[in-house]
Amino acid sequence: MAQWNQLQQLDTRYLEQLHQLYSDSFPMELRQFLAPWIESQDWAYAASKESHATLVFHNLLGEIDQQYSRFLQESNVLYQHNLRRIKQFLQSRYLEKPMEIARIVARCLWEESRLLQTAATAAQQGGQANHPTAAVVTEKQQMLEQHLQDVRKRVQDLEQKMKVVENLQDDFDFNYKTLKSQGDMQDLNGNNQSVTRQKMQQLEQMLTALDQMRRSIVSELAGLLSAMEYVQKTLTDEELADWKRRQQIACIGGPPNICLDRLENWITSLAESQLQTRQQIKKLEELQQKVSYKGDPIVQHRPMLEERIVELFRNLMKSAFVVERQPCMPMHPDRPLVIKTGVQFTTKVRLLVKFPELNYQLKIKVCIDKDSGDVAALRGSRKFNILGTNTKVMNMEESNNGSLSAEFKHLTLREQRCGNGGRANCDASLIVTEELHLITFETEVYHQGLKIDLETHSLPVVVISNICQMPNAWASILWYNMLTNNPKNVNFFTKPPIGTWDQVAEVLSWQFSSTTKRGLSIEQLTTLAEKLLGPGVNYSGCQITWAKFCKENMAGKGFSFWVWLDNIIDLVKKYILALWNEGYIMGFISKERERAILSTKPPGTFLLRFSESSKEGGVTFTWVEKDISGKTQIQSVEPYTKQQLNNMSFAEIIMGYKIMDATNILVSPLVYLYPDIPKEEAFGKYCRPESQEHPEADPGSAAPYLKTKFICVTPTTCSNTIDLPMSPRTLDSLMQFGNNGEGAEPSAGGQFESLTFDMELTSECATSPM
């Protein structure tokens, strides 16, 4: 099926992303009208070779003409009009630069295929992104259910056979003893010789039948154990492993993991069948002790069967002991696996074998870095002790669904101090945020005469001692869980693997979608790819090193890509969440793209994007204006940082933003949020109604207070060029003009410093009378 047709069948949430992909530079109608032809061209090659790009561009115009003729025959006036308009636009825009359209189309096609891939992955996972606990059963899981049912049936059938063989054996035993006691076996010379012979024959026949039945049962048991082994392998190596991988993904912001209940039902069912089978094997031993003979299959095979069933059950129990909720500090629910010393964290373990007889029987003990004692010392890692309630008894009462679990709510880590500031030696090759630690949970199960040692551990955690280490620690958690499903590779960062852009892009989008209502669009991700990898057409498969992601400074910047992005994530969550959720913040957009999309828009059209130069995270707006000569200019305001946004909401800044023209008149340059949303419609609802701004006016005073309002003002000076961002300052209330002693209090960044008559070039905010 053509790619375009496949895209049409996607879920609404994917179609939204598809819409974001297309703009005026490559209209969606064109993609629709010429889908088969567009998909048959090698756009990536055209994007890198001008001669080929020119050829493809001319062919494109030819295809448009052909399609136009078809619409003419169909008398489709609207489509004719649209197509003519598109052709004129393409000619005016790309005739001189055909490689640019080739690059745009190539990127769109790549992003489309990525979108299809994402949708397919989500579908395979049973659509958890939308319904984390929905009981979507895949074909594979139906097969598993079938196999489990088959195992249960075979166990029951064997139960019946065991009864039958027991009856036959009892009857044989009775006849044998009767004959023996009557002395018939010795007295073959008596009158009853023929009767005795007949009875002897019958007895031999019974023994043959007994032997056959025993052999059949032994063989069926062996077959049953193989079936159990297969189901167990599917459960532990596939279903449980999938759940664990999904848990990793959920930990780093991906789709929420599915509920464990169904897996628990399956595992419990298998465990019950195994215990029943073990009883049957024990029964064989009893039968053998009563009646045995030369070549008895029970003598031959029972020990091996017993060994196999015990091994299976033991392994199932071990696999069924899982960390249901990874360690997490309650104050940072969206950043699990990062633990700060001295701060409480919680975690929860669960046994997926739901045997009521185990309720309150299993005492769980928690420890950290259990197996790495000497290794840690050698590697120079820090060592920690777990403080708080580090033992807990598993029970079925604490959880809503009656699962057998233990939740640890009051654990803290304390660093073991040694001579050199906590590090076991000075040669530590890893920085603390690359140091990985494992939290281990241990218990012993005594069940039906078996002692089973259970042990499980958390995903690797990063331990920090200061919250400023959180960004780098979280980067480590992202990188680890993005690139490996090895649950305990604590040496991961001694040689960190390389990621591909596709992997990184997905994880970056999750950083937004997990804590806001919106992930990153293809357009936004492409901008981020450019920041990490430089300009390119197709970023798919491009490699990104750990150092590039988080350790090396970006070109021309004094900070790494991750530090910059993490501060933007923080900015979004704390200061501009509502605007981000609405989709009003374009956020990540290159200067070139910004210019391209704004230059065709009327003056007053503006967009919101993140600062590329602010390490702490900044947000700015860029608008279109016409200069005196009528030439289109693109202007940007100096970015607003968290510090400024602490004092005034971004929506209010936008609504009140003014520029002072040469004649000292305040005008608002911001009219339409790109593409054409009136500013009031977009941001009005996020501004406090004026009536609420001064509720404390003294009712007894003769004259009411004059209302004031903070606005941000940029004076236009001849130094402003389209390449330099305009600096917003604050225009003080006119009543306080020139009075530096009063007015708004200065904040750390000078945001509220009064503006003097000569308009200092500092970034400030102003009050002016209403």
């Epitope: 056979k161 039958v164 009856n167």
Partner: nanobody, 126 residues
């Protein structure tokens, strides 16, 4: 459940012989034969317990009919000799899990579940 499949029925001359066979799907302690002539009640003919290998017969067939079992094949046989016209009936193989299958079972007064075959027809021509 125990499945029973009979064979060997057919037409026989009075005074002649016929051998009925029945194979069970699994071992049971007790196997036997019952019959039902048109318009009459079903009656026990012969039974053989797996304990003691002793056959039990209804009075009207004693000395003429003989019951035997093959424990390997899970089969029971009824050897009918000196067949009489009153022996004509539908013959049913029966089995039960316990091993007590003497007269009480043949009289259908014994407790416990009895499994039945579909029956095989025996006709006697004089």
């Amino acid at each position: 459940d125990v499945q029973l499949v009979e064979s060997g029925g057919g037409s026989v001359q009075a005074g002649g012989s016929l051998r009925l066979s029945c194979v069970a799907s699994t071992y049971t302690g007790c196997m036997g034969w019952f019959r039902q002539a048109p318009g009459k009640e079903r009656e026990g003919v012969a039974a053989l317990s797996s304990r003691g290998f002793a056959g039990h017969y209804t009075d009207s067939v004693k000395g003429r009919f003989s019951i035997s079992r093959d424990y390997v094949k899970n089969a029971v046989y009824l050897q009918m000799n000196t067949v009489k016209p009153e022996d004509a009936a539908m013959y049913y193989c029966a089995a039960r899990e316990g091993w007590e299958c003497g007269e009480t079972w043949l009289d259908r007064t014994a407790g416990g579940h009895t499994y039945w075959g579909q029956g095989t027809q025996v006709t006697v021509s004089s």
